[in-house]
């Protein structure tokens, strides 16, 4: 799978994580920090 950094407009898309652009899937993905979950790492679960 081809990945790259998210475009500038997606700054802030991931609330508690790193935004990755999955090129072949045409979508952004949030790699959440420890303790966070959700599509945009918006939920704290500890």
């Amino acid at each position: 799978v081809s990945i790259t950094k998210c475009n500038s407009d997606m700054n802030g898309y991931c609330l508690h994580g790193q935004c990755i652009y999955l090129v072949d899937m045409s979508q952004n993905y949030c790699r959440c920090e420890v303790g966070y979950t959700g599509v945009r790492c918006e939920h704290f679960y500890l």
């Epitope: 475009n7 500038s8 945009r40």
Partner: antibody, heavy 116, light 106 residues
């Protein structure tokens, strides 16, 4: 199946306002950004602005600042675009577009006609 | 705002011809460019995103290339069903469409 269903065609008088809705199904708008794009008859595509429904943040194209308001109601999974002080040049098809979790998934479009 | 200058605004070519459309951005858009096809009365159809990634179901005669500020969209062998208007879109910093290119059959 993911869908963006927009409200029906509108006819408005110059100076009036119009509010177009865009209801999402099959996904949560809080996971996405919702963009708005318009196309006047025989003209090109024009980006108007977008909202981050989770945070409520909006960004607008400079030429529309002060005249367009994009909002979202996460309880009904619906985004809205309101354009005020309408003029004949605002006659166009208005599209909502989902981005973020999926690149550019479009609604069916809403024709807004401005005529006296 | 980033400006996108698309050229030509229209072109006429024969079936089987190679067709090339260019878009120039007013600043580096880091390959964040998409290409759309629009036929009369229809919503735009996404063909390519991130400069060169073809969407599922899009014929391989469509391709894209470029970097920095200069990008190219190519139809390697024009088919009758390719008659449409094509738009580039930068999505690095907010969004800007190019002015469109109307492709007709000679």
């Amino acid at each position: 199946q993911d869908q963006l269903v927009q409200s029906g065609a509108e006819v408005k008088k110059p100076g009036a306002s119009v509010k177009v809705s865009c209801k999402a199904s099959g996904f949560n708008i809080k996971d996405t950004y919702i963009q708005w794009v318009r196309q006047a008859p025989g003209q090109g595509l024009e980006w108007m602005g977008r909202i981050d429904p989770l945070r409520g943040n909006t960004k607008y194209r400079e030429k529309f600042e002060g005249r367009v308001t994009i909002t979202a109601d996460t309880s009904t999974n619906t985004a809205y675009m309101e354009l005020s002080s309408l003029r004949s040049e605002d006659t166009a098809v208005y599209y909502c577009v989902r981005s973020g979790t999926l690149f550019d998934f479009w609604g069916q479009g809403t024709l807004v006609t401005v005529s006296s | 705002d980033i400006q996108m200058t698309q050229s030509p605004s229209s072109l006429s070519a024969s079936v089987g011809d190679r067709v090339t459309i260019t878009c120039k951005a007013s600043q580096d858009i880091h390959k964040y460019i998409a290409w759309y096809q629009q036929k009369p009365g229809q919503a735009p159809r996404l063909l390519i995103q991130y400069t060169s990634t073809l969407q599922p179901g899009v014929p391989s005669r469509f391709s894209g290339s470029g970097s920095g500020t200069d990008y190219t969209f190519t139809i390697s062998s024009l088919q009758p069903e390719d008659i449409a208007t094509y738009y580039c879109l930068q999505y690095d910093r907010l969004r800007t469409f190019g002015g469109g290119t109307k492709v007709e059959i000679k």
